[in-house]
Interface confidence: medium
């Protein structure tokens, strides 16, 4: 093993090129200067190094930069990024969006790996907030990214970034996340006219309070059932039959198919049967005529 530590005569690498793929692992270790590797990282990605050879190259960089790689190296890691552990990445200081994009490209088309999650976390923390360009980039690579954040993390998203969000980016968000995002969206889209505003805000309505749903019902928005079914139950319950009818417009007929599912089921239980009958949909389960409706939540609030 001792003689393997010295680079064989004539094998010292003067540049990173295809000839190195024929080097054994120990030869790479002995014959490739780490500083040369760092300055020519952009070439590594074009050369078909094997998995084992990539391990050697990573080891050389680790020795050269024990405190973490500089961004000039990180940006050109390419497939070598896949050899990095979250612990390696936590040592990095990534500030350039171009660097982030270059590394996300390597992982493109696949689920978010622990490496990528750590990289994004480092990047966002370094920036202090999820600005629009960053959010644009992250949701382009990972449509579900936004919904992977905690409500606390989402609170750092500035309203201006909401413009980058597409409906599919919110598909997996839960009500707690939409509660945080909705006020930001409302603020971001506040200067739009009625119909354009509804198109933009629609995906965020799972976080909307009752008063906003009431306001929307006055604007002939024709909300579809899929959106209605994602509304907060507590926001839907206080709506009157007339308000729901206006909110849904021609889509009101879809209530019948959803009468056993929340929030429709719970809303039906809160309406007078007489009022439900005016819809002509055969919805059953409302409060029979002559019964007094006590709003216990209101009563508790008053006491």
């Amino acid at each position: 093993e001792v003689e393997k530590t010295a680079c064989p005569s004539g094998k010292k690498a003067r540049e990173i090129d295809e000839s190195l793929i024929f080097y054994k692992k120990w030869e790479l270790e002995a014959c490739v200067d780490a500083a040369l590797l760092a300055t020519q990282m952009d070439r590594v990605n074009a050369i078909p190094f094997t998995y084992e050879q990539l391990d050697v190259l990573k080891h050389k960089l680790d020795e050269l930069y024990p405190q973490g790689y500089p961004e000039s190296v990180i940006q050109h890691l390419g497939y070598l990024f896949l050899k990095m552990s979250p612990e390696d990445i936590r040592k990095w200081n990534v500030t350039s969006l171009e660097t982030l994009k270059a590394l996300l490209e390597v992982n493109k088309g696949h689920e978010m790996s622990p490496q990528v999650a750590t990289l994004i976390d480092r990047f966002v923390k370094g920036r202090g907030q999820l600005d629009k360009d960053t959010l644009d980039t992250l949701t382009a690579f990972y449509p579900g990214y936004l919904c992977s954040l905690s409500p606390e993390e989402l609170s750092s998203v500035p309203p201006s970034s909401i413009w980058a969000v597409r409906p599919q980016d919110l598909d997996t968000c839960d009500p707690r996340q939409l509660d945080v995002l909705y006020p930001k969206a409302r603020l971001a889209f506040q200067n739009m006219n009625g119909s354009e505003y509804f198109v933009k805000i629609q995906s965020f309505l799972g976080g909307a309070p009752t008063e906003d749903l009431k306001a929307l019902s006055q604007q002939n928005v024709s909300m579809d059932l899929a959106t209605f079914m994602k509304l907060r139950t507590d926001a839907v319950l206080p709506l009157t039959v007339a308000e729901v009818q206006k909110l849904l417009g021609p889509h009101v007929e879809g209530l019948k198919a959803e009468e056993r599912h929340r929030p429709v089921r719970d809303w039906i239980l809160r309406q007078r049967q007489d009022d439900l009958d005016t819809l002509g949909l055969g919805l059953q389960g409302g409060i029979p005529n002559g019964y007094l409706v006590l709003d216990l939540s209101m009563q508790e609030a008053l006491s």
């Epitope: 078909p48 094997t50 998995y51 497939y79 896949l82 088309g109």
Partner: antibody
Framework: EVQLVESGGGLVQPGGSLKLSCAAS????????MSWVRQAPGKGLEWVSE????????VYTPSVKGRFTISRDNAKNSLYLQMNSLRAEDTAVYYC?????????????????WGAGTTVTVSS | DVVLTQSPATLSLSPGERATLSCRAS?????MYWHQQKPDQSPKLLIY???NLASGVPVRFSGSGSGTDYTLTISSLEPEDFAVYYC?????????FGGGTKLEIK
């Protein structure tokens, strides 16, 4: 259907030249590393050369370096092997092979699609 | 170059029997790949990354091993399994193939 079809083989004298072609279909040719692998009569398989998607990286087995040239035309979905200074030991069936697209897109270590092969005979 | 030695060179078995094919590398490799070649046909990928079945390959085929010793097993031979089998490595350049094991009907 994913398919590779080789052509251009034949009988050639020692020192002569031949150009093999491989027509690819049924997949996005421009995304894959491609290789040539040969099989001498009654013998095993031997990797000859490979080329990356944009032709910026080319590798040869030492015994053919300087004599063979691999190239590709992504617009035509075609792979080529120009063989010069042919020797008797180059006699073989030449296969065009696709290098598998692995998880994360990194080039893998195997050939996942093979052509039917074209026969090259070097003899006087 | 990494030399791959396959054994046995020829294996004579009957349909329904279990076949065990061996491949030994001259130095340690991370993964082994297996290809099947029938007479006058091109090779076909069977196993990748040591133990993963390629698309469309029957589950009677399996691969195992690590370091320098790898095995291809066919649990119950079917008539169409009689062919030549090659192991292949790409842990270092150039990629190399074993000399092949011919599986013939007894």
């Amino acid at each position: 259907e994913v398919q590779l079809v080789e052509s251009g083989g034949g009988l050639v004298q020692p020192g002569g030249s031949l150009k093999l072609s491989c027509a690819a279909s049924g997949f996005d040719f421009s995304r894959y590393w491609m290789s040539w692998v040969r099989q001498a009569p009654g013998k095993g398989l031997e990797w000859v050369s490979e080329i990356n998607p944009d032709s910026s990286t080319i590798v040869y087995t030492p015994s053919v370096k300087g004599r063979f040239t691999i190239s590709r035309d992504n617009a035509k979905n075609s792979l080529y092997l120009q063989m010069n200074s042919l020797r008797a030991e180059d006699t073989a069936v030449y296969y065009c092979a696709r290098r598998g697209s692995h998880y994360y897109g990194y080039r893998t270590g195997y050939f996942d699609v093979w052509g039917a092969g074209t026969t090259v005979t070097v003899s006087s | 170059d990494v030399v791959l030695t396959q054994s046995p060179a020829t294996l004579s078995l009957s349909p329904g029997e279990r076949a065990t094919l061996s491949c030994r590398a001259s130095s340690s490799v991370s993964y082994m790949y297996w290809h099947q070649q029938k007479p006058d046909q091109s090779p076909k990928l069977l196993i990748y990354d040591t133990s993963n079945l390629a698309s469309g390959v029957p589950v009677r085929f399996s691969g195992s091993g690590s370091g320098t010793d790898y095995t291809l097993t066919i649990s119950s031979l079917e008539p169409e399994d009689f062919a030549v089998y090659y192991c292949q490595q790409w842990s270092s350049y150039p990629p190399t193939f074993g000399g092949g094991t011919k599986l013939e009907i007894k």
